[in-house]
Amino acid sequence: KKVVLGKKGDTVELTCNASQKKNTQFHWKNSNQIKILGIQGLFLTKGPSKLSDRADSRKSLWDQGCFSMIIKNLKIEDSDTYICEVENKKEEVELLVFGLTANSDTHLLEGQSLTLTLESPPGSSPSVKCRSPGGKNIQGGRTISVPQLERQDSGTWTCTVSQDQKTVEFKIDIVVLAFQKASSTVYKKEGEQVEFSFPLAFTLEKLTGSGELWWQAERASSSKSWITFDLKNKEVSVKRVTQDPKLQMGKKLPLHLTLPQALPQYAGSGNLTLALEAKTGKLHQEVNLVVMRATQFQENLTCEVWGPTSPKLTLSLKLENKGATVSKQAKAVWVLNPEAGMWQCLLSDSGQVLLESNIKVVPTW
């Protein structure tokens, strides 16, 4: 008996061939022996089986001895043994229809779990193997679970259902709702304008929700809300903003915030949250602001940084075109009685300069 696997909602063609390449009488029946379709003269006739309005045959191939049955919009309950009767012989085809669906919405927040459920006919014992867009392989039986979705899980998942050495492939599009980056750090000299950008890792036709940026300044004992906003069909409108600092926000996506100037008292880290309409949970992106200040006071040249820096970052003071430098893995460096000239303050990570500020030291007579 031939086994054919089908996908719920799809179309399948069950083949039946006569030895002689000519138009002859044929019938397709189900396992109850109820007629689905057949030929009467030159016409296709349909019996009262449940398949009658979804079954058809390729009339153009009848004179070649091909009497296939096409079943449209497959349902799990179409799984059955179908019998083709032609030239006094019977051909049996076992059709097994499977469905694979995501248990919840296919638009899920980062960190949420994804469950794929296999619908299968009674008596079948299929196995399922799924491959994520990032190349992660997951195996299972009736259900496949991905406990914590990551950004890279966004895209088309390819799942293969196997039964009786036959396979059928399903493609499921999963959208992980997240910001493109989990965290970003902006490095600025004191007084410079600061641009924060929060690009999303997905696109939705209608994007509606609300968000807030909470800020924990390094110098402050507690965090405070800097701005709250609404998002309606990708249009951004500010609800409330603090007086100090007075942030500005772009009206279009990606979410964009401007801090008029970087000051040491603003250095710190923030958490932008975005709650989307009809979704439980929130999207998060951490943003850090590191501010540098270089000053000369009497005989002391000082370079300082404020904000969340890693202990492996190096802060250096260097006289231009001279070898004279002072370097430390610290948040402040200084030179006493500095030589006259253009001094550079550099914040670097393994040789890569993250932030630089120049200060001119004039000779003292």
Epitope: S31, N32, Q33, I34, K35, Q40, T45, G47, P48, K50
Partner: antibody, heavy 120, light 107 residues
Framework: QVQLQESGPGLVKPSETLSLTCSVS????????WSWIRQPAGKGLEWIGR???????NYNPSLKSRVTMSIDSSKNQFSLKLSSVTAADTAVYYC??????????????WGQGATVTVSS | DIQMTQSPSSLSASVGDRVTITCQAS??????LNWYQQKPGIAPKLLIY???NLETGVPSRFSGSGSGTDFTFTISSLQPEDFATYYC?????????FGQGTRLEIK
């Protein structure tokens, strides 16, 4: 056991739409096809068509242009609408269950029938 | 559509008689034929399915035979409750069609 009960107006004016509902009790409406059959007084049976819970329908070609069938699984009911009626549509209208099993296809459960008269 | 022709249209018989009704299909319907009984003011009742199989609870005096285009329905010994109208029905092809009926009356 499954029982069927037709309901609807007994009198319909010519050119109007005849509407009947069949209520299924004692069993689920799911998984079966449900037929409508009519019988003019003193005459034979005419199959109108059938519907199932997936809303698949088959209609008798002679009535197809005027027939609409619908099903409401939550109420365990299915309905028949026949538009542009004439006196020729006066009949007893039956609803019935289509049962399929091995070597068997038949209308095994019937309603008691609803008499519909088309007259102005 | 497949036409179903029953004969006779009506017949008179007595209790205890053997009665035969025939049904002819306009084309080959294999064994896809049912027989129904209908009493006045009551819905039809399925008696025989698949040309020759007795529905559960139907007395064995009722029988059916035939295949292709010619079918026969027999009551071996008429009982008072058997006086009714009998219909054949084909289910080989949609639309499902019925014979015009055979009215069985008391002689």
């Amino acid at each position: 056991q499954v029982q069927l009960q037709e309901s609807g107006p007994g009198l319909v004016k010519p050119s109007e739409t005849l509407s009947l509902t069949c209520s299924v009790s004692g069993g689920s409406i799911s998984t079966y096809y449900w037929s409508w059959i009519r019988q003019p007084a003193g005459k034979g049976l005419e199959w109108i068509g059938r519907i199932c819970t997936t809303e698949n329908t088959n209609y008798n070609p002679s009535l197809k242009s005027r027939v609409t069938m619908s099903i409401d699984s939550s109420k365990n009911q299915f309905s028949l609408k026949l538009s542009s009626v004439t006196a020729a549509d006066t009949a007893v209208y039956y609803c019935a269950r289509d049962l399929e099993r091995l070597n068997y296809y038949g209308m095994d459960v019937w309603g008691q029938g609803a008499t519909v008269t088309v007259s102005s | 559509d497949i036409q179903m022709t029953q004969s006779p249209s009506s017949l008179s018989a007595s209790v205890g008689d053997r009665v035969t009704i025939t049904c002819q299909a306009s084309q080959d319907i294999s064994k896809y034929l049912n027989w129904y009984q209908q009493k006045p003011g009551i819905a039809p009742k399925l008696l025989i399915y698949d040309a020759s199989n007795l529905e559960t609870g139907v007395p064995s005096r009722f029988s059916g035979s035939g295949s292709g285009t010619d079918f026969t329905f027999t009551i071996s010994s008429l009982q008072p409750e058997d006086f009714a109208t009998y219909y054949c029905q084909q289910y080989d092809s949609l639309p499902i069609t019925f014979g015009q009926g055979t009215r069985l009356e008391i002689k």
